[in-house]
């Protein structure tokens, strides 16, 4: 053990205050009691310590709490949180949403760091599920948070939490994630009337099956093209021309601009050309009249 330098006479810290910003690193190490620091952590964030000084303060806390910091200290870490490694954070047991908010605030405006990802992971695992309040908080700080979760992790989201999700929170979700979220959203919004339901469910429709799209087509919902283009190709293919026309309403004319892109391209290839012609959009590539359409997927299922 290296012999520690003694604190110079008269410099022993009686409280965590701004006088400490003028202490050299070795003076902080020698003159600040770790237990005092732990009880007055809420002051650290208000004092403009240098990064080097924060390193010393972190070291003192690490010595005091080798098994991980208590939540009373974690809640007041402030900018010291930026000094923590994912390994440090894995030792914590964070249960309070207030603590989570306080630490996310420190990282606000930045990309989700490995520290933040570890913190969130620890918090959610500790709670057992991603409840509404937690989801509210996380998506407020990180709109893309939901889409960073695996389908397995998303399965722990209770339907009641879906009310906290905003359309922008789903912007980067892939179809596998929407497959998990859509049934939860359908359950969450099931008691809403037609137009209100569509507004809420719209951003989740990338996970909707064919039968639900057929049902929506009967409700005059006027789906916009941007939403239509995010639908699962396998869910769109079985829709008839009439169903797509009802589903899109006045937006149907947008199909022309998207005829070379999925799922529109694949859908066109499955429709009879004379049915497509009824739209009056000049869509080409449908099945010529007189051709027989075999549903090979059904044939495979029977064999």
């Amino acid at each position: 053990e290296v012999e520690k330098t003694a604190c110079p006479s008269g410099k022993k810290a009686r409280e965590i205050d701004e006088s400490l910003i003028f202490y050299k690193k070795w003076e902080l190490e020698a003159c600040v009691d770790a237990a005092l620091l732990a009880t007055q952590m809420d002051r650290v964030n208000a004092i403009p310590f240098t990064y080097e000084q924060l390193d010393v303060l972190k070291h003192k806390l690490d010595e005091l709490y080798p098994q991980g910091y208590p939540e009373s200290v974690i809640q007041h870490l402030g900018y010291l949180f930026l000094k923590m490694s994912p390994e440090d954070i894995r030792k914590w047991n964070v249960t309070s949403l207030e603590t989570l908010k306080a630490l996310l605030e420190v990282n606000k405006g930045h990309e989700m760091s490995p520290q933040v990802a570890t913190l969130i992971d620890r918090f959610v695992k500790g709670r057992g599920q991603l409840d509404k309040d937690t989801l509210d908080t996380l998506t407020a700080f990180y709109p893309g948070y939901l889409c960073s979760l695996s389908p397995e992790e998303l399965s722990s989201v209770p339907p009641s939490s879906i009310w906290a999700v905003r359309p922008q929170d789903l912007d980067t979700c892939d179809p596998r994630q929407l497959d998990v979220l859509y049934p939860k959203a359908r359950l969450a919004f099931q008691n809403m009337n037609g137009s209100e339901y569509f507004v809420k469910i719209q951003s989740f429709l990338g996970g909707a099956p064919t039968e639900d799209l057929k049902a929506l087509s009967q409700q005059n919902v006027s789906m916009d093209l941007a939403t239509f283009m995010k639908l699962r190709t396998d869910a769109v293919l079985p829709l008839t021309v009439a169903e797509v026309q009802k589903l899109l309403g006045p937006h149907v004319e947008g199909l022309k601009a998207e005829e070379r892109h999925r799922p529109v391209r694949d859908w066109i290839l499955r429709q009879r050309q004379d049915d497509l012609d009824t739209l009056g959009l000049g869509l080409q590539g449908g099945i010529p009249n007189g051709y027989l359409v075999l549903d090979l997927s059904m044939q495979e299922a029977l064999s």
Epitope: G10, E18, F22
Partner: antibody, heavy 116, light 110 residues
């Protein structure tokens, strides 16, 4: 008990000089930054200058930079403000205060009047 | 013209709650702690709140401070006649390399 006692104020003509002193007691003076704050008659508070414990850097308000000099003598527990080229607008009560980020103790102030 | 902006006056009857705002910028309040000072008539200022929300010993818990973004506020609950004074907010401003005060708020107890 922390005490700060200013002295050196008085009446001086425009262009003249004054040196204010602040005697400190009741705390370890050499550990703390110190500041000067002034208040013109009927006006609000205006920060004038600050100095860290070891005097390695000094801070001034734009209104006094180049004319005022702050210093300290840790062996005498005393803070100073040398004021040169005084102007009428420097007329104020001058307070010395402990710290530089939050002034937890103040002296009673000394009045400086700049007038011909 | 002060760097920090405070309302010139505020008033209330005894027992009421009065709140004083202090608006700054990202270079002062946004990145540094805020303090509040009380100046009774004819006396030196006294520290009321430091580090945004801390009260020095001896300051009644009727006084509370908070900070959010580039603004801070001082609340006085259960207003008393002895609270009639001028109140100043202040913060360090690294861009100016100096301390900045608000213009002060005169609190009157009606």
């Amino acid at each position: 008990e922390v005490q700060l006692l200013e002295s050196g104020g008085g009446l001086v003509q425009p262009g003249g000089s004054l040196r204010l002193s602040c005697a400190a007691s009741g705390f370890t003076f050499s550990n703390y930054a110190m500041s000067w704050v002034r208040q013109a008659p009927g006006k609000g508070l205006e920060w004038v200058s600050g100095i860290p414990p070891n005097s390695d850097s000094k801070y001034y308000a734009d209104s006094v930079r180049g004319r005022f000099t702050v210093s300290r003598d840790n062996s005498k527990n005393t803070l100073y403000l040398q004021m040169n080229s005084l102007r009428a607008e420097d007329t104020a009560v001058y307070y010395c205060a402990k710290n530089m980020l939050s002034f937890d103790y103040w002296g009673q102030g000394t009045l400086v009047t700049v007038s011909s | 013209q002060s760097v920090l902006t405070q309302p010139p006056s505020a008033s209330g009857t005894p027992g009421q709650r009065v709140t004083i705002s202090c608006t700054g910028s990202s270079s002062n309040i946004g990145s540094n702690a805020v303090s509040w000072y009380q100046q009774l008539p004819g006396t030196a200022p006294k520290l009321l709140i430091y580090y945004n929300s801390k009260r020095p010993s001896g300051v009644p818990d009727r006084f509370s401070g908070s900070k959010s973004g580039t603004s801070a506020s001082l609340a006085i609950s259960g207003l008393r006649s002895e609270d009639e004074a001028d109140y100043y907010c202040g913060s360090w401003d690294p861009s100016l390399n100096g301390y900045v005060f608000g213009g002060g708020t005169k609190v009157t107890v009606l």
